[in-house]
């Protein structure tokens, strides 16, 4: 387990090996107190498949940089992204895809087909989410890719498209 | 509240009844430090409605056995399952169903209809998730049933189909 | 950070300012021990767009009143609602909408279009969920609006329609 989970915990307090159940600072230092979280809404103007986010959202123990959430404390993170699509159906079906990327590698994706009847309709709403539970190291980047980003309606739904992470456990 | 939440906490330290606010070990032993979690991906070859999972996933304080997650520490758990379907549409609609079972009882299900136009198309993607917040006792089993398991495409989407649990609170 | 996070922690124990790493009660009082949660199923008989919930569900540190969850401890909350719809398709498409309201203001919504082929079918299932991570103050209300509440089939799916919240961190 990590031993730096208490802010301002001095390094000169020794941690006993093995059973430290009566060494209270030892117990405390091993306890999973650390909390890190983020909750960002999608940027107003999207112009590429890698989504950008409003950096004035909730950020605590996580940095935002160039479309990435950057992890500052290692541990087990719960990551969840939810997107709201509004599709003007062409005369063929459309596959909506949401990719969660960790360090520019696809970690998990969600796909849904809309407009499957092949009829041109006024509009079709679709909501897509993806979650992940994963160990992340310091400076790991978390990002989201959507090939059909033009269907993310940021003007009608400015609050609906979010990327969120929170640290569940900073112990191994 | 559980009293064994600190690893290696000796049984011979008495817990005061009532207000133990100045008995630090008492406080610590009652504090919700315990963390248990699992994140398993679906097994490559599915041949029955009860899904099997890759036991080499993330498992901490939870066991995997015969398609079940088996709880080892009692408490309030957040349970979430997400599945990615790929359906070759027949000439009728298809109902996709995901059932979360606790001790072999259906606790929660999610259903979505696809191929509703009744047209035979090449393929339709659908993503389905289900969550649960529930008190689980030691040896409680968590499992997932999918009637239409043949539509879970484990070769194209080996990472997308997951069952995850994590202990939120080990106090009552 | 909040200083009342240990139940029964006496007020007469002073909290040192600055580095309190060796003042164990200080550390404990600042630690995010507080846990609050709720998991409620939808009421059997719905007759308005603001959903009502069965108050005999799981409630801990959160109150239920008149369709609202009422927050009792300030902090960062994870809020999630999931609904199961069963739609008898008319001869036009139907937009299903789920709104999460904080203090009667729409905070987040999810929309999905069903029956998009415009064909009258026997039934179409659709599952819709919405989550939120937000700082909530004492007496904040959390509620859910569904315009098409008549499609929430509480008799077939009494367990599927839920509203859940849990406190992630009571620190700022």
């Amino acid at each position: 387990q990590r031993t730096d989970s208490i802010p301002n915990s001095p390094d000169n307090i020794p941690l006993r090996g093995g059973n430290c159940s009566e060494d209270l600072l030892c117990i405390l230092k091993r306890a999973p107190f650390k909390k890190s979280w983020a909750y960002l809404q999608v940027a107003k103007h999207l112009n590429k498949t890698k989504l950008s986010w409003n950096k004035d959202g909730i950020l605590h123990g996580v940095r935002y940089q160039d479309g990435n959430l950057v992890i500052q404390f290692p541990g087990l993170y719960f990551i969840i992204c939810q997107l709201q699509f509004l599709v003007q159906c062409p005369n063929n079906s459309v596959d909506l895809k949401l990719e969660l990327l960790i360090n520019k590698h696809i970690k998990k994706q969600a796909l849904v087909t809309v407009c499957e009847s092949g009829m041109q309709t006024k509009h079709v709403y679709q909501n897509l989410s993806q979650f992940l539970l994963d160990y992340l190291q310091v400076n790991t980047t978390v990002s989201v890719n959507v090939d059909t980003f033009q269907y993310i309606d940021t003007s009608t739904f400015p609050l609906e498209n979010v990327l969120s992470v929170f640290l569940y456990s900073n112990s191994d | 509240q559980r009293t064994d939440s600190i690893p290696n906490s000796p049984d011979n330290i008495p817990l005061r009844g009532g207000n133990c606010s100045e008995d630090l070990l008492c406080i610590l032993k009652r504090a919700p430090f315990k963390k248990s979690w699992a994140y398993l991906q679906v097994a490559k070859h599915l041949n029955k409605t009860k899904l099997s999972w890759n036991k080499d996933g993330i498992l901490h304080g939870v066991r995997y056995q015969d398609g079940n997650l088996v709880i080892q520490f009692p408490g309030l758990y957040f349970i979430i399952c997400q599945l990615q379907f790929l359906v070759q549409c027949p000439n009728n609609s298809v109902d996709l169903k995901l059932e979360l079972l606790i001790n072999k009882h259906i606790k929660k299900q999610a259903l979505v209809t696809v191929c509703e136009s009744g047209m035979q198309t090449k393929h339709v993607y659908q993503n389905l998730s289900q969550f649960l917040l529930d008190y689980l006792q030691v040896n409680t089993t968590v499992s997932v049933n999918v009637d239409t398991f043949q539509y879970i495409d484990t070769s194209t989407f080996p990472l997308e189909n997951v069952l995850s649990v994590f202990l939120y609170s080990n106090s009552d | 950070q909040r200083t009342d996070s240990i139940p029964n922690s006496p007020d007469n124990i002073p909290l040192r300012g600055g580095n309190c790493s060796e003042d164990l009660l200080c550390i404990l009082k600042r630690a995010p021990f507080k846990k609050s949660w709720a998991y409620l199923q939808v009421a059997k008989h719905l007759n308005k767009t603001k959903l009502s919930w069965n108050k005999d569900g799981i409630l801990h540190g959160v109150r239920y009143q008149d369709g609202n969850l009422v927050i009792q401890f300030p902090g960062l909350y994870f809020i999630i609602c999931q609904l199961q719809f069963l739609v008898q398709c008319p001869n036009n498409s139907v937009d299903l909408k789920l709104e999460l309201l904080i203090n009667k203001h729409i905070k987040k919504q999810a929309l999905v279009t069903v029956c998009e082929s415009g064909m009258q079918t026997k039934h179409v299932y659709q599952n819709l969920s919405q989550f939120l991570l937000d700082y909530l103050q004492v007496n904040t209300t959390v509620s859910v609006n569904v315009d098409t509440f008549q499609y929430i089939d509480t008799s077939t799916f009494p367990l599927e329609n839920v509203l859940s919240v849990f406190l992630y961190s009571n620190s700022d």
Partner: antibody, heavy 124, light 110 residues
Framework: QVQLQESGPGLVKPSETLSLTCTVS????????WSWIRQPAGKGLEWIGR???????NYNPSLRSRVTMSRDTSKNQFSLKLSSVTAADTAVYYC??????????????????WGQGTTVTVSS | QSALTQPASVSGSPGQSITISCTGT?????????VSWYQQQPGKAPKLMIY???KRPSGVSNRFSGSTSGNTASLTISGLQADDEADYSC??????????FGGGTKLTVL
């Protein structure tokens, strides 16, 4: 070790359908992703599409309206059909196995095994 | 999808190092760590030399290395040898779950 062999007619008339088959030996077609790539004389490579073990497909957007890929697990083969061909479709056509790992995340690692290629000429 | 941009030709003397660039977009090279490089001798099928930006398949000399910066990938060959003379093509996975290749670069060993 996996080996690939393309086969099919070397000459196709304009407006007709080009049909090629790739036979896989040394491995199961159900275990990997399979791609078709072409290369006009003196030009660069162009990716046509891929077929997964499940039978689902991804196609190059510029060719999507004309391409169909399928597989036959009993024969350990996958095939390419390109409709309404023109002289611009004249090229060497390669089938290839995609190197994909999925231990922790998706490792899309390119094409690690190629057939020797077959020349297709579109001419009347 | 547009082809990735590579120089038509590069050259170098034996023992030297050369670098071939491959420019894409934020939807391919700049998005993923899924860039590959191929060597193609005349009349032969391509051979995978680098995958996932900088990894080498077994059997490929460590004289071959890859990197990316922004939307541009690079292949560097150090200690140039006569039998390195060939066409080199880059490839990248794209946001639409497809692959895109570069136009190819002819390497001449002087």
């Amino acid at each position: 070790q996996v080996q690939l062999q393309e086969s099919g007619p070397g000459l196709v008339k304009p407006s007709e359908t080009l049909s090629l088959t790739c036979t896989v030996s040394g491995g199961s077609i159900s275990s990997y992703y399979w791609s078709w790539i072409r290369q006009p004389a003196g030009k660069g490579l162009e990716w046509i599409g891929r077929i997964f073990a499940s039978g689902s497909t991804n196609y190059n957007p510029s060719l999507r309206s004309r391409v169909t890929m399928s597989r036959d697990t009993s024969k350990n083969q996958f095939s390419l059909k390109l409709s309404s061909v023109t002289a611009a479709d004249t090229a060497v056509y390669y089938c290839a196995k995609e190197r994909v790992g999925v231990q922790d995340y998706y490792h899309y690692s390119g094409m690690d095994v190629w057939g020797q290629g077959t020349t297709v000429t579109v001419s009347s | 999808q547009s082809a990735l941009t590579q120089p038509a030709s590069v050259s170098g003397s034996p023992g030297q190092s050369i670098t071939i660039s491959c420019t894409g977009t934020s939807s391919d090279v700049g998005l993923y760590n899924y860039v590959s490089w191929y060597q193609q001798q005349p009349g032969k099928a391509p051979k995978l030399m680098i995958y996932e930006v900088s990894k080498r398949p077994s059997g490929v000399s460590n004289r071959f290395s890859g990197s990316t910066s922004g939307n541009t990938a690079s292949l560097t060959i150090s200690g140039l040898q006569a039998d390195d003379e060939a066409d080199y093509s880059c490839s990248s996975y794209t946001s639409s779950s497809t692959w895109v290749f570069g136009g190819g670069t002819k390497l001449t060993v002087l």
